[in-house]
C-alpha cells in the first residue's frame, strides 16, 4: 500500500543537492550532467530507464558539441570489445571500456563504471537536445552485448553506500520552450539513493516490478474520464508495460490504442480533430491562453498494487498527453501534439505519463511507487491523481508471457 | 529560419525511377512529419504520401501507393522520395513541404520531365 | 476521397477592391481547412490554417471563414502582389485534398 513505515537509512527525505539536476523536455528526453575520466570531463547524460547501458558519444559528430575523449583519461581502462546496438530504426556502436564516472549534483561518490564509447552512429544523436550519452537505468538482462555487463547503477550500488534505489521528478513546462530556455530551464529531479518528500504530494503507492529487466509493470485496468475501457486485460500489457523515461509518448499496443483514441475522440467531440492529430502528424492550435482543457478526458491506468487484489489509479490529465509545441509559422497560437501513439512493443509509460508524477524506482524492494508529482502541469479544475486501494481481482492474468524466443528483441 | 530544399529538375526516360531529396534545416527534424505533393499544369495539386522522420513510419495516397516511396536519413535531415516505372503522366513539379497545421513550410519545386 | 471544389476557375478584380474566393468540400471537415497562394513558377504560399487562422507574417487584408462544407477566403484592398492562383486544402482526413484552384486576374 502507501509508504508510510519508518525510514530506511538513505531515505532521510531531503536530498536538496540532487533537486534540480535535470535539464531538458519531453520531446527530446531529460539529462544530468556527469563527469567521465581523469581529469574529469563534464557531459551531459539523457536519462533513460528504458535501457541498460551508459554509452557516450567519443568521436565527432554533427549534433555533439562535445564527447568523451578516451585518450586523455588516464583512469580509462579498454576491455577489448566492441558494441552494437541496433534499434528498429537506427543504431548505435562503439567500444567497450571502464573508466572513473561521478555525478556533480548526485551523491558524492565517484565509481569505475563500464562505459560504451560510441564511434558510430545513425538516428541516435538529436540534434538541439543538447546531451551527448545516454544512461541506461534498466537492469543487466537488457544491456547490450550481453548481460554480464553489469550497469551503471548496479556498478554504483555495488562500490558505494548509496541505498539501491532513485527517483525521479521529470517537469514538463506546459509550453514550449527555445532552445535558451532549455538550457536555462529547470527540468526535474534525479534522486539517487533515495526519496525527497519535497517532490511530491500525497501519498506514494508501489506496483510490483514483474520481471527485473525494463522496469516491467502490470495494468489491470484502462478508463477515459472515469469510463472502463472493457479489454481484456492482457491487451494492456501485451507484450509487456514499462517505465521509460527515455520515451516521449504514453505508446499503446495497437489494439488499446485505437479503443483509446475512439473513447477521447467520443469524449472531446464538442471540436472536430483532423485525422492526422490522432496519428501524431498535425498539430492543434487555440489562440494564446483559450486551449479548452476541459473539453479532453483524464486518462487512468490501474497498477497492480502490493498487496493481494489490489490495485490503485494514476490519472493523467490532456496537460501530459496534449504536448506544447513551438512552430514559428503559428507562433500567435498554443499549439500541441497528441502524445499517445500506438506501439509493436506493448505499453511504455514514457514522459507524458511520468510528467504527472514523482516516481520511485525502488529496486531493492522490486516495486515501483508513484506519488502526484509537486511540478505537474494542471489547471484550476483537475489535478493529476493517484488514489487507491481498488479491489481488482485476477490481475496475475493480466501480464503477458512472452515466448522465450523473443525475449532478447530490443525495446525502441 | 525554417528551409527545405529540393534537389534539382530532372530528365528521365519512360520506363526508369527518378529519386528527388528534400533537405530540411532550421528546425528539430524529427518532430515534424514531411508531405509530398504533385502539381501537372492545369490539375492542380496532388497528396501524395507522408513519412514521420522519427520512426519512417509512411503512409500513401492510395493513388500513389505503387508509384511513390519515402524514405528517409536522419543524419543529413534528407527526405527521399523515389518514384518507380516513369510515364509521361509522372511529367510535373513535385514539392516537399512540412507538417505543423497543415502545411506552413513548402521546399521551392523540382520539375521532373519524362521523355523518351 | 473528399473533393474540394472551388468553382471558380478565374476571378477579376481591380486594385483596391475586395474579392471573396470559396471553395466547397464534399463531406463535414469540420474547421480543418487551408489555403495557399501561389505564383506563377513559385511555390505554394501557407495563408490561412484552421479556416480563419493567420500563418505568421501573413498581411490581415486575407481572411478566413466557414465550417463544415463551406469556405471562402476574403482578400480586402487588393494588391497587386495579390494577383495569384489561389488554393484551398482539408487536411481533415487522409487523403488530404486540393480544389482545383482560382486565378486572381486584373480587370
Known amino acids: 500500500e502507501t509508504d508510510e513505515e519508518p525510514e530506511e537509512p538513505g531515505r532521510r527525505g531531503s536530498f536538496v543537492e540532487m533537486v534540480d539536476n535535470l535539464r531538458g523536455k519531453s520531446g527530446q528526453g531529460y539529462y544530468v550532467e556527469m563527469t567521465v575520466g581523469s581529469p574529469p570531463q563534464t557531459l551531459n547524460i539523457l536519462v533513460d530507464t528504458g535501457s541498460s547501458n551508459f554509452a557516450v558519444g567519443a568521436a565527432p559528430h554533427p549534433f555533439l558539441h562535445r564527447y568523451y575523449q578516451r585518450q586523455l583519461s588516464s583512469t580509462y581502462r579498454d576491455l577489448r570489445k566492441g558494441v552494437y546496438v541496433p534499434y528498429t530504426q537506427g543504431k548505435w556502436e562503439g567500444e567497450l571500456g571502464t573508466d572513473l564516472v561521478s555525478i556533480p549534483h548526485g551523491p558524492n561518490v565517484t565509481v569505475r563504471a563500464n562505459i560504451a564509447a560510441i564511434t558510430e552512429s545513425d538516428k541516435f544523436f538529436i540534434n538541439g537536445s543538447n546531451w551527448e550519452g545516454i544512461l541506461g537505468l534498466a537492469y543487466a538482462e537488457i544491456a547490450r552485448p550481453d548481460d554480464s555487463l553489469e550497469p551503471f547503477f548496479d556498478s554504483l550500488v555495488k562500490q558505494t553506500h548509496v541505498p539501491n534505489l532513485f527517483s525521479l521528478q521529470l517537469c514538463g513546462a506546459g509550453f514550449p520552450l527555445n532552445q535558451s530556455e532549455v538550457l536555462a530551464s529547470v527540468g526535474g529531479s534525479m534522486i539517487i539513493g533515495g526519496i525527497d518528500h519535497s517532490l511530491y504530494t500525497g501519498s506514494l503507492w508501489y506496483t510490483p516490478i514483474r520481471r527485473e529487466w525494463y522496469y516491467e509493470v502490470i495494468i489491470v485496468r484502462v478508463e477515459i474520464n472515469g469510463q472502463d475501457l472493457k479489454m481484456d486485460c492482457k491487451e494492456y500489457n501485451y507484450d509487456k508495460s514499462i517505465v521509460d523515461s527515455g520515451t516521449t509518448n504514453l505508446r499503446l499496443p495497437k489494439k488499446v490504442f485505437e479503443a483509446a483514441v475512439k473513447s477521447i475522440k467520443a469524449a472531446s467531440s464538442t471540436e472536430k480533430f483532423p485525422d492526422g492529430f490522432w496519428l501524431g502528424e498535425q498539430l492543434v492550435c487555440w489562440q494564446a491562453g483559450t486551449t479548452p482543457w476541459n473539453i479532453f478526458p483524464v486518462i487512468s491506468l490501474y497498477l497492480m498494487g502490493e498487496v493481494t487484489n489490489q490495485s490503485f489509479r494514476i490519472t493523467i490529465l490532456p496537460q501530459q498527453y496534449l504536448r506544447p509545441v513551438e512552430d514559428v509559422a503559428t507562433s500567435q497560437d498554443d499549439c500541441y501534439k497528441f502524445a499517445i501513439s500506438q506501439s509493436s512493443t506493448g505499453t511504455v509509460m514514457g514522459a507524458v505519463i511520468m510528467e504527472g508524477f514523482y516516481v520511485v524506482f525502488d529496486r531493492a524492494r522490486k516495486r515501483i511507487g508513484f506519488a502526484v508529482s509537486a511540478c505537474h502541469v494542471h489547471d484550476e479544475f483537475r489535478t493529476a491523481a493517484v488514489e487507491g486501494p481498488f479491489v481488482t481481482l485476477d490481475m496475475e492474468d493480466c501480464g503477458y508471457n512472452i515466448p522465450q524466443t523473443d525475449e532478447s528483441t530490443l525495446m525502441t | 529560419e525554417v528551409q527545405l530544399q529540393q534537389s534539382g529538375a530532372e530528365l528521365v526516360r519512360p520506363g526508369t525511377s527518378v529519386k528527388l531529396s528534400c533537405k530540411a534545416s532550421g528546425y528539430t527534424f524529427t518532430s515534424y512529419w514531411i508531405h509530398w505533393v504533385k502539381q501537372r499544369p492545369g490539375q492542380g495539386l496532388e497528396w501524395i504520401g507522408m513519412i514521420d522522420p522519427s520512426d519512417s513510419y509512411t503512409k500513401y495516397n492510395q493513388k500513389f501507393k505503387d508509384k511513390a516511396t519515402l524514405t528517409v536519413d536522419t543524419s543529413s535531415s534528407t527526405t527521399y522520395m523515389h518514384l518507380s516505372s516513369l510515364t509521361s503522366e509522372d511529367s510535373a513539379v513535385y514539392y516537399c513541404?512540412?507538417?505543423?497545421?497543415?502545411?506552413?513550410?513548402w521546399g521551392q519545386r523540382t520539375l521532373v520531365t519524362v521523355s523518351a | 476521397d473528399i473533393q474540394m471544389t472551388q468553382s471558380q476557375k478565374f476571378m477579376s478584380t481591380s486594385i483596391g477592391d475586395r474579392v471573396s474566393v470559396t471553395c466547397k468540400a464534399s463531406q463535414n471537415v469540420g474547421t480543418n481547412v487551408a489555403w495557399y497562394q501561389q505564383k506563377p513558377g513559385q511555390s505554394p504560399k501557407s495563408l490561412i490554417y484552421?479556416?480563419?487562422h493567420w500563418y505568421s507574417g501573413v498581411p490581415d487584408r486575407f481572411t478566413g471563414s466557414g465550417s463544415g462544407t463551406d469556405f471562402t477566403l476574403t482578400i480586402s484592398n487588393v494588391q497587386s502582389e495579390d494577383l495569384a492562383e489561389y488554393f484551398c486544402q482539408q487536411y481533415n482526413s487522409y487523403p488530404y485534398t486540393f480544389g482545383g484552384g482560382t486565378k486572381l486576374e486584373i480587370k
Open positions: 513541404a512540412r507538417s505543423g497545421v497543415a502545411f506552413p513550410y
Open positions: 484552421s479556416a480563419s
